[in-house]
């Protein structure tokens, strides 16, 4: 079955860096847009970044643009999020999620990982 | 960006009763709206897309309705396992925005 497993979260100081990974299985990874969605403690969901199936096209929410880099390795069925210049407001559980492959499905996220916690604090 | 306002913030319902959750968009999203369920410590799960189409495997007691700016998620015959926070998401303007969530508690 479809599985997404995030890793790489942890405690980091403001200004620091972290690299998150998301290992995918149970589907043809290279066919799908994948994104990172985050959730600050006790808060709602916030889309962060998306990457096209080939990895050639990316898009970021403005608050992270220039600091975060989304990438993927289709040979390893893995998605990455390189986070630099981290701020306290980046503290959140980071989920990777698959955009549905359903024809005319739009930006619906049909499978999610369990999330990895990133804490930015001194 | 399109802002989604969910109400109420918290809803307390007895087992077997009906829960009605509202989501209002700041401008029309046609029917391009999804609902997700998130249980404590778990990832969100897609329930409804296209405002009213149930995702595969989602029980029939979950139903979505609405179009334009006003949407409703109805949970009939509420069960204990339905205790969760529910989020609406518009995808009219990619990649979409989420509402603030409605927490459903079981009395």
């Amino acid at each position: 079955q479809v599985q997404l497993v995030e890793s790489g979260g942890g405690l980091v100081q403001p200004g620091g860096s972290l690299r998150l990974s998301c290992a995918a299985s149970g589907f043809t990874f290279s066919y799908y847009d994948i994104q990172w969605v985050r959730q600050a403690p006790g808060k709602g969901l916030e889309w962060v970044s998306s990457i096209s199936p080939s990895g050639q096209s990316t898009y970021y929410r403005r608050e992270v643009k220039g600091r975060f880099t989304i990438s993927r390795d289709n040979s390893k069925n893995t998605l990455y999020l390189q986070m630099n210049s981290l701020r306290a407001e980046d503290t959140a559980v980071y989920y990777c999620a698959r955009r549905t492959g359903r024809e005319e499905g739009g930006w619906i996220f049909d499978y999610w990982g369990q999330g990895t916690l990133v804490t930015v604090s001194s | 960006e399109i802002v989604l306002t969910q109400s109420p913030a918290t809803l307390s319902v007895s087992p077997g009763e009906r829960a009605t959750l509202s989501c209002r968009a700041s401008r029309s999203v046609r029917r391009e709206l999804a609902w997700y369920q998130q249980k404590p410590g778990q990832a969100p799960e897609l329930l409804i897309y296209g405002a009213s189409t149930r995702e595969t495997g989602i029980p029939a007691r979950f139903s979505g309705s609405g179009s334009g700016t006003d949407f409703t998620l109805t949970i009939n015959s509420l069960e204990a396992e339905d205790a969760a926070t529910y989020y609406c998401q518009q995808y009219r303007d990619p990649p979409g925005t989420f509402g603030g969530g409605t927490k459903v508690e079981i009395k």
Epitope: D33, Y59, K65, G105 | I2, E32, D93
Partner: antibody
Framework: REQLEESGGDLVKPEGSLTLTCTAS?????????VCWVRQAPGKGLEWIGC???????TAYASWAKGRFTISKTSSTTVTLQMTSLTAADTATYFC???????????WGPGTLVTVSS | DVVMTQTPASVSEPVGGTVTIKCQAS??????LAWYQQKPGQPPKLLID???DLASGVPSRFKGSGSGTEYTLTISALECADAATYYC????????????FGGGTEVVVK
């Protein structure tokens, strides 16, 4: 390498119809791209015609283009622009362009020339 | 539809000089603004998105700024290769408001 190429440009008589095709290579439209058509009359500026979100099928058109122009995703690598009731004012180079998630265009085709004349 | 008004229509500056191009939107487009460079016989090339973010490979001599309805492209240390026509473009809420280009500014390098 990801590329777009337009085809179908031709000399057509006034009131005639024409379908242009935008073909992707190095990637497919199975992802959610905005694929848009933009035209440029000889010696003039860029004019947006319309777009299709290849992931959802949503379309958006310039006010003046509604009714006469139709954008469709016809396969995982092709998007078409159907044009009807053509007039001399539609003479232009027609470009297709791609944006990811939003419609700023980091990939353009070289353009195809449409001439409407009797 | 959003309307983009671009000024001036043409500007001539010497090599090493600075060019400023302005673009006004008919409504607040929340910085969803791109700038393109187009040379004769070629398709446009993306220079800047989100009003101020340089596209990959674009030199830092190109600078975008602005918010709300008022946006500016500044080209400093002008080079001969910068001779081209420049267009602004809004892409705010495409499904609702569509896409709109400015009328273009021809930059002549003396």
């Amino acid at each position: 390498r990801e590329q777009l190429e337009e085809s179908g440009g031709d000399l057509v008589k006034p009131e005639g119809s024409l379908t242009l095709t935008c073909t992707a290579s190095g990637f497919s439209f199975s992802s959610s791209y905005w694929v848009c058509w933009v035209r440029q009359a000889p010696g003039k500026g860029l004019e947006w015609i319309g777009c299709i979100d290849t992931g959802s099928g949503n379309t958006a058109y310039a006010s003046w283009a509604k009714g006469r122009f139709t954008i469709s995703k016809t396969s995982s690598t092709t998007v078409t622009l159907q044009m009807t009731s053509l007039t001399a004012a539609d003479t232009a180079t027609y470009f297709c362009a791609r944006g990811y998630v939003v419609a700023h265009f980091n990939l353009w085709g070289p353009g195809t020339l449409v001439t409407v004349s009797s | 539809d959003v309307v983009m008004t671009q000024t001036p229509a043409s500007v001539s500056e010497p090599v090493g000089g600075t060019v400023t191009i302005k673009c006004q939107a008919s409504e607040d487009i929340e910085r969803y603004l791109a700038w393109y460079q187009q040379k004769p016989g070629q398709p446009p090339k993306l220079l800047i998105d989100d009003a101020s973010d340089l596209a990959s490979g674009v030199p830092s001599r190109f600078k975008g700024s602005g918010s709300g309805t008022e946006y500016t492209l500044t080209i400093s240390a002008l080079e001969c290769a910068d001779a081209a026509t420049y267009y602004c473009q809004s892409y705010y809420a495409i499904s609702t408001y569509g896409v709109a280009f400015g009328g273009g500014t021809e930059v002549v390098v003396k």
